[in-house]
């Protein structure tokens, strides 16, 4: 999480700040959505439990050519301790369920806001 601020950051970003910034980006995506997000692309649903940041990234990284979620993908990579590449799948994916990116983002946002309110940042 120390790298989330990027090169311009004066120092490590507190986990609560990093989570708040991710939430704000997801809010931004949901509020600015006019046409179907990522052309209605479908992604694997995930279990919103421990390890969900990597699972979320593994799902979203398979969506290509969608500038709206590029910043989210970068931010999620800061929460995931290992390198994630397209085609990777963890046990946290609900492998028989695909949902639209817009719904995925909405579900993720709701869960992250509750984690923030409860003080669970890692």
């Amino acid at each position: 999480l120390t790298c989330l601020g990027g090169f311009a950051s004066p120092g490590p970003v507190p986990p609560s700040t990093a989570l708040r910034e991710l939430i704000e980006e997801l809010v931004n995506i949901t509020q600015n959505q006019k046409a179907p997000l990522c052309n209605g692309s479908m992604v694997w649903s995930i279990n919103l439990t421990a390890g969900m940041y990597c699972a979320a990234l593994e799902s979203l990284i398979n969506v290509s050519g969608c500038s709206a979620i590029e910043k989210t993908q970068r931010m999620l990579s800061g929460f995931c301790p290992h390198k994630v590449s397209a085609g990777q799948f963890s046990s946290l994916h609900v492998r028989d369920t695909k949902i639209e990116v817009a719904q995925f983002v909405k579900d993720l946002l709701l869960h992250l806001k509750k984690l923030f309110r409860e003080g669970q940042f890692n």
Epitope: P14, S16, T17, L110, H111, K114, R117, G119, F121
Partner: antibody, heavy 120, light 112 residues
């Protein structure tokens, strides 16, 4: 229009049980937290506990843990307060309230309250 | 548990008066996410409480500007700059930072 409506209050004997309901409309309870708060006659407000209906994560004031149980039914868009081993001092108006939906910073909507009287 | 101590428990005032209610927490109510979840609620007899102020100093939508909140750490204040007839009620502070959440004992504002 957002609304919370409590029901299930009434007269119960000491040692008895009661289940209060909080029916929500105008929003999905999974999107927020539902809290239970009570107020004894002429007294102040007491926070009992809350539930996150999205995952059944429940927190209580330890004072109520064990005797009181909070639950939710997402299909019915309702939350519940099961009260067991009731005592005279549990006589109060019981309210449900929701956390606002943006950052869950405060209680923006409350029910009208339901009166529970514990007496023989 | 965090105790929220309100003072005074009651006060008599006249329309137009400036009223100040204080609330002291037994320990810091700064949440681990950096926010201070200190709220003020107004309650009238037979009615559910209504939110006035959240996160110490933010006025809830529709709340008149005569209501203001301030404070930090463990000491907080609700001020009514010019008391109106509809303001006679009981006021509660509330901390939503640390579970179990807790209310203050209330301050009843009565007509002098």
């Amino acid at each position: 229009e957002v609304q919370l409506v409590e029901s299930g209050g009434g007269l119960v004997q000491p040692g008895g049980s009661l289940r209060l309901s909080c029916a929500a409309s105008g929003f999905n309870i999974k999107d927020t937290y539902i809290h239970w708060v009570r107020q004894a006659p002429g007294k102040g407000l007491e926070w009992i506990g809350r539930i996150d209906p999205a995952n059944d994560n429940i927190k209580y004031d330890p004072k109520f843990q064990g005797r009181f149980t909070i639950s939710a039914d997402n299909a019915k868009n309702s939350a519940y307060l099961q009260m067991n081993s009731l005592r005279a001092e549990d006589t109060a108006v019981y309210y449900c309230a929701r956390s606002e939906e943006n950052w869950y910073d405060f209680f923006d909507y409350w029910g009208q309250g339901t009166l529970v009287t514990v007496s023989s | 548990d965090i105790q929220m101590t309100q003072s005074p428990s009651s006060l008599s005032a006249s329309v137009g008066d400036r009223v100040t209610i204080t609330c002291r927490s037994s320990q810091s109510i700064v949440h681990s996410n950096g926010n201070t979840y200190l709220e003020w609620y107004q309650q009238k007899p037979g009615k559910a409480p209504k939110l006035l102020i959240y996160k110490v100093s933010n006025r809830f939508s529709g709340v008149p500007s005569r209501f203001s909140g301030s404070g930090s750490g463990t000491d907080f204040t609700l001020t009514i700059s010019s008391l109106q007839p509809e303001d006679f009620a009981t006021y509660y502070c509330f901390q939503g930072s640390h579970i179990p959440y807790t209310f203050g004992g209330g301050t009843k504002v009565e007509i002098k």
